[in-house]
Interface confidence: low
């Protein structure tokens, strides 16, 4: 966030940088002396460093130019007084920090830092073997038959010559299974049983552990070599092969380190190789026993129309746009191809029906005309464009279509089984004549369209994938009696036990993704955080945590007040809202440091020029950013004036709110997303907006456009009321 400081700038120097840094560069060997680049042997965690809690742990530092140089030295252990298991490259100071430990070691913790990249030697974190397991450096210490291993440095009960000092680099540590000579059976050890001298350990092959569904587009495993054994090139490197698959350009493709991936609809995962003569090769990843797509990966199946790019289209149209018939997918005539049903098992390549197995812009097929290889089936209508009863007017309270599926593909459950729940959140008798079967309806006057109950206890109800009819301009917020509703509830400054709550920012949440701050959020209820859709790059909720009660993004100095909570569910906002309600695994404990923030009245209007603030730990424009929460002061701007400031290129609607900076060049930026626009009315602070990716960071004269919380207030209340929350 480009901002004024909220707190004094205490530069908390990085623990590891207190060491004396010698500005000596490692020469990079050229010509015949050029060594192989070993950075592909490391797992990278961007913007992360390791902090030693145990002061006895040693580290070594040196000035260098690139992370590749750090990696080569770590791999060779040259000049290091320990076995290097990981290193951090400090991009700002062009410096290596080599470690004899990694993030799994005791006495160490991970910490976020923009200028740091952590690289951990994969051999020390891998729990499977490649080939004979010569490079295995994991911590299994039990043999195949369950006998505990004898330590390598011990001669009891078995004398031997496999001394750690004789096998440098083979990591004969503790009593871990190893294969120092690369013998056929794989890693082994001397056993602690005097009757059994040695035995192999039952460590699986990585190719056995790894499996994929369908053609592996959603595969995010750790296979890092091809089917012929070639090591994969890192996706963030352009040598030896230049390519377009840059991790930062395709953040959703899982381009981590040098792992096999399928970003482009190939039959199975592949990678570029480190062999200059072999640009790319497929990887040997077996198909999972249950070869079906995860629910989360299934595109919404349609038969009559195209949703999105039509990857879920399962209809029977079998001609391209101009009527030329399609070639059968299992035929190689007139066009040879590898888009066969065998190669693309989950893509329903039946007969000669139009399909989109490779992520093209819409369904297509090979044609039966020898002169026209492929064509798009663009005559299939788009689901969003369908007319008649498949669209609704206003907020859809009169919708009488017969769609009975939610936007996530769940089948609606019967209205008559859910009347009790419905009565719980509406205060009038619903029109039973409209609530027939399990069709999508809007009995509670929901501003965001028809919805239905589901049979899934985790998702009690959801919206249906129906759009407003084209050209319908009926406002969804209708306030005839009160043309201007105040945003604040009528109550004045809140008082708890007779003492006004301190005007802190205890509702501010740091959403963590894989141990790093990724977004802001607002605690609106003990178990609920309001944030933005763009904050969730992974579908795995184990990747996320919510930190509450902190001022420092790293939690430094906040130990007494910090609460760390897991995330149990994400509830996505109405279509196009960019909002997410994040359910916490247990309720936050409200205290002096953690509090909730109020929501505005539904459909309210806040006067122009009202002074508001945005808060965040995001991009600040400072390389030595101190990690403290920042604030930028903005003022509310009317939608028309806002549009003018955006040179007429932006038309704001009722779901957006605009605020301009008091100090030019301040405003929200990356890392602030999900955080709140907070305004005060009648001495009450409310979250009136949510920061979502906009049009550049704090661009002078370009006010920020936020999601208008007042427009979604009823949805938020409805979720809080209807979704089950854990008890503390």
């Amino acid at each position: 966030m480009w901002v004024t400081k909220l707190l004094p700038a205490l530069l908390l120097q990085h623990v590891l940088l207190h060491l004396l840094l010698l500005p000596i560069a490692i020469p990079y060997a050229e010509g015949q002396r050029k060594r192989r680049n070993t950075i592909h042997e490391f797992k990278k965690s961007a913007k992360t460093t390791l902090i030693k809690i145990d002061p006895a742990l040693k580290i070594k530092t040196k000035k260098v130019n690139t992370a590749d140089q750090c990696a080569n030295r770590c791999t060779r252990n040259k000049g290091l007084p320990f076995t290097c298991k990981a290193f951090v490259f400090d991009k700002a100071r062009k410096q290596c920090l080599w470690f004899p430990f990694n993030s799994m070691s005791s006495g160490v913790k991970k910490e976020f830092g923009h200028e740091f990249d952590l690289y951990e030697n994969k051999d020390y974190i891998r729990n499977c073997i490649i080939g004979k397991g010569r490079s295995y450096k994991g911590t299994v210490s039990i043999t195949k038959s369950g006998i505990k291993c004898q330590p390598w440095s011990s001669m009891i009960p078995h004398e031997h010559s496999f001394l750690p000092s004789s096998y440098r680099g083979k990591d004969l540590q503790e009593n871990y299974c190893r294969n120092p000579r690369g013998e056929e059976g794989g890693p082994w050890c001397f056993t602690s049983n005097p009757e059994v001298r040695y035995e192999v350990c039952d460590i699986p092959q990585c190719s056995e552990v790894e499996c994929m569904t369908c053609n592996g587009e959603s595969y995010r495993g750790l296979m890092d070599h091809t089917e012929s054994g070639k090591i994969c090139q890192r996706w963030d490197h352009q040598t030896p092969h230049r390519h377009k698959f840059l991790p930062e350009r395709y953040p959703d493709k899982g381009f981590d380190d040098n792992y096999c991936r399928n970003p482009d609809g190939q039959p199975r995962p592949w990678c570029y190789t480190l062999d200059p003569h072999t640009r790319w090769e497929y990887c040997a990843i077996k198909t999972c026993a249950d070869n079906t797509m995860n629910d989360t990966d299934v595109p919404l199946e349609t038969t009559e129309c195209i949703q999105g790019q039509g990857e879920g289209y399962r209809g029977t149209v079998n001609t391209i746009w101009n009527g030329i018939p399609c070639q059968r997918w299992d035929s190689q005539y007139p066009h040879e191809h590898d888009m066969t049903p065998e190669n693309f098992k989950c893509k329903d390549l039946r007969e000669n029906y139009c399909r989109n197995p490779d992520g093209s812009e819409s369904p297509w097929c090979f044609t039966t005309d020898p002169n026209i290889r492929v064509g798009y089936c663009s005559q299939i209508p788009n689901c969003d464009m369908s007319h008649g009863q498949d669209c609704y007017r206003g907020n859809g309270k009169n919708y009488m279509g017969n769609l009975s599926q939610t936007r996530s593909g769940l089948t609606c459950s019967m209205w008559d089984k859910n009347m009790e729940d419905l009565h719980r959140h509406i205060f009038w008798e619903p029109d039973a004549s409209k609530l027939n079967e399990n069709y999508c309806r809007n009995p509670d006057d929901d501003a965001h369209g028809p919805w239905c109950y589901t049979g899934n206890p985790l998702i009690p109800w959801d919206y249906c994938p129906i759009s407003r009819c084209e050209g319908d301009t009926t406002p969804t917020i209708v306030n005839l009696d009160h043309p201007v509703i105040s945003c604040a509830k009528t109550k004045q400054l809140r008082v708890v036990n007779g003492i006004p709550t301190r005007t802190n920012i205890g509702w501010m949440v740091s959403l963590r993704y894989r141990n790093k701050h990724i977004c802001g959020g607002s605690l609106i209820k003990e178990s609920w955080v309001l944030t933005a859709r763009q904050c969730f790059p992974s579908r795995d909720l184990k990747d996320y945590e919510a930190w509450l009660g902190i001022h420092d993004v790293h939690g430094r100095g906040d130990e007494k007040c910090k609460q760390v909570l897991n995330v149990s569910q994400l509830v996505y906002g109405p279509e196009g809202s960019d909002l997410v309600l994040m359910k916490l695994a247990r309720p936050a404990v409200l205290d002096d440091f953690v509090s909730t923030i109020d929501l505005p009245n539904y459909g309210c209007t806040i006067p122009e020029k009202t002074s508001c603030s945005v808060y965040g730990w995001g991009y600040t424009g400072l390389i030595n950013y101190d990690g403290l929460l920042r604030v930028a002061h903005l003022y509310i701007m009317g939608n028309e004036k806002c549009s003018q400031h955006h040179r007429g290129k932006v038309t704001l609607n009722e779901s957006e709110i605009c605020a301009g900076a008091e100090k030019i060049g301040s405003g929200p930026c990356e890392g602030d997303y999900g955080g709140p626009l907070v305004c005060e009315q009648h001495k009450m602070r409310m979250v009136l907006g949510v920061i979502v990716p906009g049009r550049g960071c704090a661009i002078p004269n370009r006010p920020g456009i936020f999601v208008r919380v007042a427009y979604y207030a009823k949805w938020i209340h409805k979720i809080i009321l209807t979704y089950k929350v854990p008890q503390s």
Partner: antibody
Framework: EVQLVESGGGLVQSGGSLKLSCAAS????????MSWVRQTPEKRLEWVAY????????YYPDSVKGRFTISRDNAKNTLYLQMSSLKSEDTAMYYC???????????????WGQGTSVTVSS | DIQMTQSPASLSVSVGETVTITCRAS??????LAWYQQKQGKSPQLLVY???HLPDGVPSRFSGSGSGTQFSLKINSLQSEDFGSYYC?????????FGGGTRLEIK
């Protein structure tokens, strides 16, 4: 070899406009924050504007805010400075500058162009 | 805004001598300071970054020291090619500001 070549300077009336360009070569332009720095006839150096590597963030000191606009075309490896409502105190040698690469761009200015002279006559 | 005060404004010295130029920041800028050298008719060149680090190609007779608010640039055994102007600059957030400069002349 890193090269920054400015152009577009000249004599302009007070209140007039001018657009400076800077052609960059010898490095991956799109990876670096870029700045314009000017040197007054009294030899004082003043930072005028910067732009982030992708062009999403720009920043100016109060003395030029609202009058100068920095922009870049990464496809053409070119940096621009559009100057309007020029004043006599804007008379200076204008340098195109590369900032050392870093996540935030708040780094020392490691390469400077040869400069282009702007004279504003009243 | 952070003010950078450089002293002395000018200095007249002989070849072979050692000189020290100082720069004071109006608030703590940690080690976010650079020194530049400008020869007559040329553009400035980076001499020191991060207060103490020399870029490749800068002779070792130049050295930077200091952190926080007090910084200095030392030139040992002055050579004829070292004459010109020297500027300090902070990059602890915007606006970046430069010192007023120190003009080094041959005695």
């Amino acid at each position: 070899e890193v090269q920054l070549v400015e152009s577009g300077g000249g004599l302009v009336q007070s209140g007039g406009s001018l657009k400076l360009s800077c052609a960059a070569s010898g490095f991956t332009f799109s990876n670096y924050f870029m700045s314009w720095v000017r040197q007054t006839p009294e030899k004082r150096l003043e930072w005028v504007a910067y732009i982030s590597s992708g062009g999403g963030s720009t920043y100016y000191p109060d003395s030029v805010k609202g009058r100068f606009t920095i922009s870049r075309d990464n496809a053409k490896n070119t940096l621009y400075l559009q100057m309007s409502s020029l004043k006599s105190e804007d008379t200076a040698m204008y340098y195109c500058v590369r900032q050392g690469d870093g996540y935030y761009g708040d780094y020392a200015m490691d390469y400077w162009g040869q400069g282009t002279s702007v004279t504003v006559s009243s | 805004d952070i003010q950078m005060t450089q002293s002395p404004a000018s200095l007249s010295v002989s070849v072979g001598e050692t000189v020290t130029i100082t720069c004071r920041a109006s608030e703590n800028i940690y080690s976010n300071l650079a020194w530049y050298q400008q020869k007559q008719g040329k553009s400035p060149q980076l001499l020191v970054y991060d207060a103490t680090h020399l870029p490749d190609g800068v002779p070792s007779r130049f050295s930077g020291s200091g952190s926080g608010t007090q910084f200095s640039l030392k030139i040992n055994s002055l050579q004829s090619e070292d004459f010109g102007s020297y500027y300090c600059q902070h990059f602890w957030g915007t606006p970046y500001t430069f010192g007023g400069g120190t003009r080094l002349e041959i005695k």
